[in-house]
């Protein structure tokens, strides 16, 4: 767990889309695998904020026990608090569930800072503001943890939506989404719209406000503007993608594109920041500093430690550059770019701001485990995790924070050669050496 970096930080109506069409084999506009259009029952089913994670309401067991569960595309275990903890308002009580089955197996998940451990079992799980289905899923009942749960975050567990390869204790433990797709007619796709407030929210405001939407089994057109652009999922473990170019205010960082993906690039809703490999981070900060040189900030700000405050309503967004990440496209030698604003990478901090001040943390940080496109990136976009077609789609989010001069953007196509060379091939090592926490 890291302070406001890795979350947890490693900080309705029914109606399932049944009997849906499979993707058409056609060169015309490809049909998405899954219903398109309106998913009214799933819209606005997330709450939370980038610094503490976005969560969805789920029920576990019989009779159903309601819990708030962090949506995490950077891990693959469904794990819930199952014992009293000072930061938990409620927890999963296995003894009260007639459908709980013990797998008689433990699981231990260490992060860079902190850990959780628990006991594996299965139970019936459903998502009240999701598809109208119930599935039997693997559950890690967390009995002990350190620096995992976050005080005031209002979630009691984590829904790992990535692939089995990174599940703990090993890839034989089927992740929740795999179980859902296998046991129901829900298409193998989900999409996320994370809505950053753009201003600090206190705890009661978070509870009352909308945090976004997780559309299970499809795409909702009301959640984005413009077109969806897709990038291939390079390998099904994390949601790994390939970045082929980075620009700050249109200025190319001019690095070997392998550096951008060293040792991987992933899309991770459970991480707060945009995290960049050391060399890339240093180059990006140098460029952002140069672009915003009309004002000077302390070193601690660029390290994500110190806050910068302006009088309420006077934040000089215009002095900060836009950041563009070019992603490999679906067509050979074709890429597209996603562009975020300072409104995404300067994260409002609630516990310090007052009515007189707007305070922000710099939400781009250094990584030793590759690029992580965390909540600050995802808050600009509607992101489609099209597992069926092994691709991730990006479109401008209908809820992204912007100003009258600039907006987040998804644009293409651009001609980019030799994009395959941008991927880094991680040397094969014993799987147990995989880092769980992203430092």
């Amino acid at each position: 767990t890291q302070h406001g970096i890795r979350l947890p930080l490693r900080s309705g109506l029914g109606g399932a889309p049944l009997g849906l069409r499979l993707p058409r084999e056609t060169d015309e506009e490809p049909e998405e695998p899954g219903r398109r259009g309106s998913f009214v029952e799933m819209v606005d089913n997330l709450r939370g904020k980038s610094g503490q994670g976005y969560y969805v309401e789920m029920t576990v067991g019989s009779p159903p026990q309601t819990l708030n569960i962090l949506v995490d595309t950077g891990s693959s275990n469904f794990a819930v608090g199952a014992a009293p903890h000072p930061f938990l308002h409620r927890y999963y009580q296995r003894q009260l569930s007639s459908t709980y089955r013990d797998l008689r197996k433990g699981v231990y998940v260490p992060y860079t800072q902190g850990k959780w451990e628990g006991e594996l079992g299965t139970d019936l799980v459903s998502i009240p503001h999701g598809p109208n289905v119930t599935v039997r899923a693997n559950i890690a009942a967390i009995t002990e943890s350190d620096k995992f749960f976050i005080n005031g975050s209002n979630w009691e567990g984590i829904l790992g939506l990535a692939y089995a390869e990174i599940a703990r204790p090993d890839d034989s433990l089927e992740p929740f989404f795999d179980s859902l797709v296998k046991q129901t007619h829900v298409p193998n796709l989900f999409s996320l719209q994370l809505c950053g407030a753009g201003f600090p929210l206190n705890q009661s405001e978070v509870l009352a406000s909308v945090g976004g939407s997780m559309i299970i089994g499809g795409i909702d057109h009301s959640l984005y503007t413009g077109s969806l652009w897709y990038t291939p999922i390079r390998r099904e473990w994390y949601y790994e993608v390939i970045i082929v170019r980075v620009e700050i205010n249109g200025q190319d960082l001019k690095m070997d594109c392998k550096e951008y993906n060293y040792d991987k690039s992933i899309v991770d809703s459970g991480t707060t920041n945009l995290r960049l490999p050391k060399k890339v981070f240093e180059a990006a900060v140098k460029s952002i500093k140069a672009a915003s040189s009309t004002e000077k900030f302390p070193d601690g700000f660029w390290l994500g430690e110190q806050l910068v405050c302006w009088q309420a309503g006077t934040t000089p967004w215009n002095i900060f550059p836009v950041i563009s990440l070019y992603l490999m496209g679906e067509v050979t030698n074709q890429s597209f770019r996603i562009t975020i604003l300072p409104q995404q990478y300067l994260r409002p901090v609630e516990d310090v701001a007052t009515s007189q001040d707007d305070c922000y943390k710099f939400a781009i940080s250094q990584s030793s485990t590759g690029t992580v496109m965390g909540a600050v990136i995802m808050e600009g976009f509607y992101v489609v995790f099209d597992r069926a077609r092994k691709r991730i789609g990006f479109a401008v989010s209908a809820c992204h924070v912007h100003d009258e001069f600039r907006t987040a953007a998804v644009e293409g196509p651009f001609v980019t050669l030799d994009m395959e060379d941008c991927g880094y091939n991680i040397p094969q090592t014993d799987e147990s050496t995989l880092m769980t926490g992203r430092a």
């Epitope: 601690g300 110190q306 910068v308």
Partner: antibody, heavy 120, light 108 residues
């Protein structure tokens, strides 16, 4: 070594503008590593931050004084200045100039201070 | 804005005694806290920064500790020249505008 020295009138009439200058000697005000600030201390009271400036002209002001304060820099003279308009007796204080690091962002070097009395 | 509360307001001690000064922040300031010493008629002088690092030329009898909201300045054995007013300041938020109200260390 680097030193800071405040200068300016010790007496200002109410409603007038207080003007002070801080001269930096033994080093350059154009260092990219520092801001240059003003802090004041009313007699027998605590410290109040007024504002600061970077050699390029970028400024930060205390919101409670912002409407009355102007800080400017003259790199050719290695000086920075404070102007506080529409003064009242409540502005009577010892005014200090100081250096603020961007690496270690504290006031690591101070001038001796100059007492400014607002009185008719 | 973050408020810094220093206690006690006055500390009456004899030379050679240990002085313990407290500074409490209304919200966490991480380790971004400094201590200054101010003698009568003089400008403040930076003693400790980043909660526990001694500034250049500061004697080893001065030490700082704490993080988050609670901080302590300790003078292990008071020398006659240590009787002064001590201020804490947070720079967790930029610009660095918040000082504590001060603690006066006087001779008993």
């Amino acid at each position: 070594q680097l030193q800071l020295q405040e200068s300016g009138p010790g007496l200002v009439k109410p409603s007038e503008t207080l003007s002070l200058t801080c001269t930096v000697s033994g080093g350059s005000i154009s260092s990219s590593s520092y801001y240059w600030g003003w802090i004041r201390q009313p007699p027998g009271k605590g410290l109040e931050w007024i504002g600061m400036i970077y050699y390029s002209g970028s400024t930060w002001y205390n919101p409670s004084l912002k409407s009355r304060v102007t800080i400017s820099v003259d790199t050719s003279k290695n000086q920075f200045s404070l102007k506080l308009s529409s003064v009242t007796a409540a502005d009577t204080a010892v005014y200090y100039c100081a250096r603020v690091g961007l690496g270690v962002s504290y006031f690591d070097l101070w001038g001796r201070g100059t007492l400014v009395t607002v009185s008719s | 804005e973050i408020v810094l509360t220093q206690s006690p307001a006055t500390l009456s001690l004899s030379p050679g005694e240990r002085a313990t000064l407290s500074c409490r922040a209304s919200q966490s300031v991480s380790s971004y806290l400094a201590w200054y010493q101010q003698k009568p008629g003089q400008a403040p002088r930076l003693l400790i920064y980043d909660a526990s690092k001694r500034a250049t030329g500061i004697p080893a009898r001065f030490s700082g500790s704490g993080s988050g909201t609670d901080f302590t300045l300790t003078i292990s054995s008071l020398e006659p020249e240590d009787f002064a007013v001590y201020y804490c300041q947070q720079v967790y938020t930029w610009p660095p505008r918040t000082f504590g109200g001060g603690t006066k260390v006087e001779i008993k």
